[in-house]
Interface confidence: low
């Protein structure tokens, strides 16, 4: 039908920096490039109905549903979502097309559903249907990449069995140590599955999809480097592929490399060699040891020997299940208010862990650093000197680990007081936990030096918000002290703090009566 307008429906994904419910907008915010949603005429429907392709949105993502109408004259419109009407302000772009937008900020379950846009132009009326759902990521998996030798070629293929299909990249570095950090200029990334250049110093393969990024490093023994102080150790689970690269550089080609497992040469088909000349005409040789699917009997010391270099070994340990080894006993720390301090957990784990630090039900990102001895360490320094319980939680495919820390901040007590008809209470959160004294103020003791010992009840309680301890002291009122000012004092090794309370009077003029007597 030539009277029908030309409709274009697009989805615009935004970088999140705002929060609101869905709203109709005439000028959507600046964002990513639009994705065409098709907008095809829906057959067998009463009236003219266009249907956009279904939109799947991540939780908390921000999007704009936008319709571009190429029709003469003015248009008016109305959005309907879950039987509620939302106002609609069309405007015209530079090509004189009508533009109608619906902005959904911070997508939630309640904002999923069908969005209907009714448009009235001078020529005709029509409806546009958008179906918006929250992307269900339960199906998604992100598996650590592993290596395979490419058939009939000296090349490695990187494989990650993940859903959705991940983007695989090789991360290569040719310098030593710290300069091989992700952001370093020495690092080269290649977004491809097959790698032919296998002579580099540091070779990693990473896979990323909506769930994040997982990397596997090509385990390497470099005969030109001094060996680590502790024997390098490689863990694998039964059925996983084993890859170890032995690398050596020599002034000429007159040297060879061999692999042995527990003093027995590796069988043919479990190794392959490559060599090349470097820019300074020295010869680089690499010899790969590989087992496509390891079994328990592949455990042992793998030694790479050279006719021109000292040999080096690595201990390969094959386990049935993954593990996390660390001491899970809880640890308590007390520090001064301005003292620099970090929690740290040292652990050995396979496969690599995912971890979080939690304080007061809030989670913080967790970084891990590999140590030379095969252990890893995770530190948390962002406590902002808040006392309480801190939790380190780590897990991998097969194991979970939780460790509790308590942080106490040494400080002078701060006292809060409250009184009721029958008692007075004081609270303090100083550390070390304070001791209490109660004193009565009267004409005989204007400086409040008369100590009260009867009817006092002290206790410490856990204030659940931060898991920190709060000490309290309660004074039960007796006739002898009603109508008087009393002072509660909390003291610890860092100082004393007091609060004065006027206790309820038994008669109308307590002080005058007291003075007369």
């Amino acid at each position: 039908n030539q009277d029908l307008p030309v409709i274009k429906c697009v989805l615009i994904n935004h970088k999140n920096n705002d929060s609101s419910v869905g709203k109709s907008s005439s000028y959507p915010m600046v964002s990513e490039s639009p994705e065409d949603l098709g907008c095809a005429l829906r057959p067998q429907s009463s009236g003219t109905v266009y249907e956009a392709a279904a939109v799947e949105v991540d939780v908390s993502a921000s999007i704009t549903l936008q319709v571009l109408v190429d029709a003469p004259g003015n248009i008016s419109c109305l959005w309907v979502f879950k039987h509620s009407s939302l106002n609609c302000q069309p405007h015209f772009d530079l090509q004189n097309r009508g533009v109608v937008s619906m902005v959904i900020l911070k997508m939630t379950e309640t904002q999923a559903g069908e969005y209907l846009l009714f448009i009235q132009s001078e020529a005709t009326n029509y409806t546009i249907l958008f179906t918006v759902s929250i992307r269900n990521t339960l199906l998604y998996t992100l598996r650590r990449p592993y290596f395979r030798k490419m058939e009939n070629q000296d090349a490695l293929v990187c494989i990650s069995e993940s859903v959705p299909e991940p983007i695989v990249e090789w991360v290569l570095c040719d310098s030593q140590g710290e300069s091989c950090k992700e952001e370093s200029p020495a690092v080269v990334k290649k977004e491809e599955k097959v790698l032919h250049e296998l002579f580099g110093t540091d070779i990693r393969c990473c896979a990323r999809n909506e769930l994040g990024r997982e990397c596997t490093r090509l385990f390497t023994i470099d005969l030109n480097q001094t060996p680590q102080t502790t024997l390098p150790q490689l863990f694998l689970k039964v059925g996983e592929p084993l890859w170890i690269r032995c690398k050596a550089v020599h002034v000429n080609h007159g040297f060879g490399l061999t692999w042995e497992l527990e003093n027995k040469a590796l069988e043919e088909g479990n190794y392959f060699e490559m060599s090349t000349y470097s820019t300074n005409r020295t010869m680089i040789r690499i010899l790969f040891a590989f087992v496509s699917s390891v079994a328990r009997n592949d455990t042992g010391y793998y030694t790479c020997s050279s006719s021109k270099h000292p040999s080096q070994s690595a201990l390969v340990t094959i386990v049935e299940k993954g593990f996390i080894n660390a001491t899970n006993s809880s640890e308590d720390y007390e520090i001064d208010q301005y003292e620099e301090f970090c929690f740290s957990v040292r652990f050995k784990a396979y496969p690599q862990i995912r971890c979080t630090w939690t304080f007061s039900r809030k989670s913080f990102p967790c970084e891990q650093k590999g140590l030379d001895n095969g252990y890893s360490i995770s530190k948390f320094c962002n406590h902002k000197h808040q006392p309480g319980e801190y939790i380190f939680h780590a897990e991998n495919d097969d194991a979970q680990f939780t460790k509790m820390f308590t942080l106490n901040i040494r400080r002078k007590p701060q006292v809060l007081a409250e009184a009721s008809a029958s008692q007075a209470s004081c609270f303090s959160d100083g550390y070390p936990l304070p001791s209490w004294t109660w004193k009565k103020c009267s004409d005989k003791s204007p400086n409040c030096t008369e100590e009260i010992t009867e009817g006092v009840w002290n206790r410490k309680a856990n204030r659940k918000v931060f898991g920190q301890w709060v000490s309290s002291s309660t004074l039960n009122m007796s006739e002898a002290i009603k109508g008087f000012l009393v002072k509660c004092c909390a003291y610890n090794s860092l100082g004393t703090s007091c609060e004065t309370i006027l206790l309820n009077s038994p008669g109308p003029f307590p002080f005058i009566q007291d003075n007369i007597s």
């Epitope: 279904a54 939109v55 799947e56 759902s133 929250i134 992307r135 269900n136 339960l138 199906l139 998996t141 598996r143 069995e161 993940s162 859903v163 689970k237 039964v238 059925g239 996983e240 699917s293 049935e320 299940k321 495919d397 097969d398």
Partner: antibody, heavy 120, light 107 residues
Framework: QVQLVQSGAEVKKPGASVKVSCKAS????????MHWVRQAPGQGLEWMGI????????SYAQKFQGRVTMTRDTSTSTVYMELSSLRSEDTAVYYC?????????????WGQGTLVTVSS | DIQMTQSPSSLSASVGDRVTITCRAS??????LNWYQQKPGKAPKLLIY???SLESGVPSRFSGSGSGTDFTLTISSLQPEDFATYYC?????????FGGGTKVEIK
């Protein structure tokens, strides 16, 4: 109770396409993924792919990539599996199965199956 | 893809027998394994999920065990209605893959 009812048997010529439907009832259609699994005569089970009825996203087995299309119609709680460029080795019973649990990996309810015969 | 190998491919047993079927994965799949029963001309039926959890409505004579690469389905006392083909299936990584099946026949 949960039911998956599939369309009837089909006979197709090599090179043609077939579209099998699977109508779900007895549960919230958009809350569970739907798998398609096939079984050649006298053979084992072969996973073909999966569709998210909520948003329509799909994931197909490598073997069927480019030949299979899975779609859904939420208004009728029906999923469809279309297989194109049919060859004789595609003769099989095709099942839809509801996925539950981690990675939607437990196939807890199955359709009765649709026999597709490819023969010249 | 992860390969699933079932053994034996067929076995003959009598009513009341204890029957054991094994399934081996080509790599560790943790506990991500299901067992199904299929009778001729019928769709498969879920018996055990997550290696050892019994699906509701399934008789307690069926049990599953194992983790990593080796798994077992046990029928403690075979009943006449248990003569069927049994399949294991991993869902540790996509695509899900099935074992070749074990046919349990009447001796």
């Amino acid at each position: 109770q949960v039911q998956l009812v599939q369309s009837g048997a089909e006979v197709k010529k090599p090179g043609a396409s077939v579209k099998v439907s699977c109508k779900a009832s007895g549960y919230t259609f958009t809350k569970y993924y739907m798998h398609w699994v096939r079984q050649a005569p006298g053979q084992g089970l072969e996973w073909m792919g999966i569709i998210n009825p909520s948003g329509g996203s799909t994931s197909y087995a490598q073997k069927f990539q480019g030949r299979v299309t899975m779609t859904r119609d939420t208004s009728t709680s029906t999923v469809y599996m279309e297989l194109s460029s049919l060859r004789s080795e595609d003769t099989a019973v095709y099942y839809c199965a509801r996925g539950r649990g981690y990675s939607y990996g437990y196939l807890d309810y199955w359709g009765q199956g649709t026999l597709v015969t490819v023969s010249s | 893809d992860i390969q699933m190998t079932q053994s034996p491919s067929s076995l003959s047993a009598s009513v009341g027998d204890r029957v054991t079927i094994t399934c081996r994965a080509s790599q560790s799949i943790s506990s991500s394994l299901n067992w199904y029963q299929q009778k001729p001309g019928k769709a498969p039926k879920l018996l055990i999920y997550k290696a050892s959890s019994l699906e509701s409505g399934v008789p307690s004579r069926f049990s599953g065990s194992g983790s990593g690469t080796d798994f077992t389905l046990t029928i403690s006392s075979l009943q006449p209605e248990d003569f069927a083909t049994y399949y294991c299936q991993q869902y540790y990584s996509y695509p899900p893959t099935f074992g070749g099946g074990t046919k349990v026949e009447i001796k």
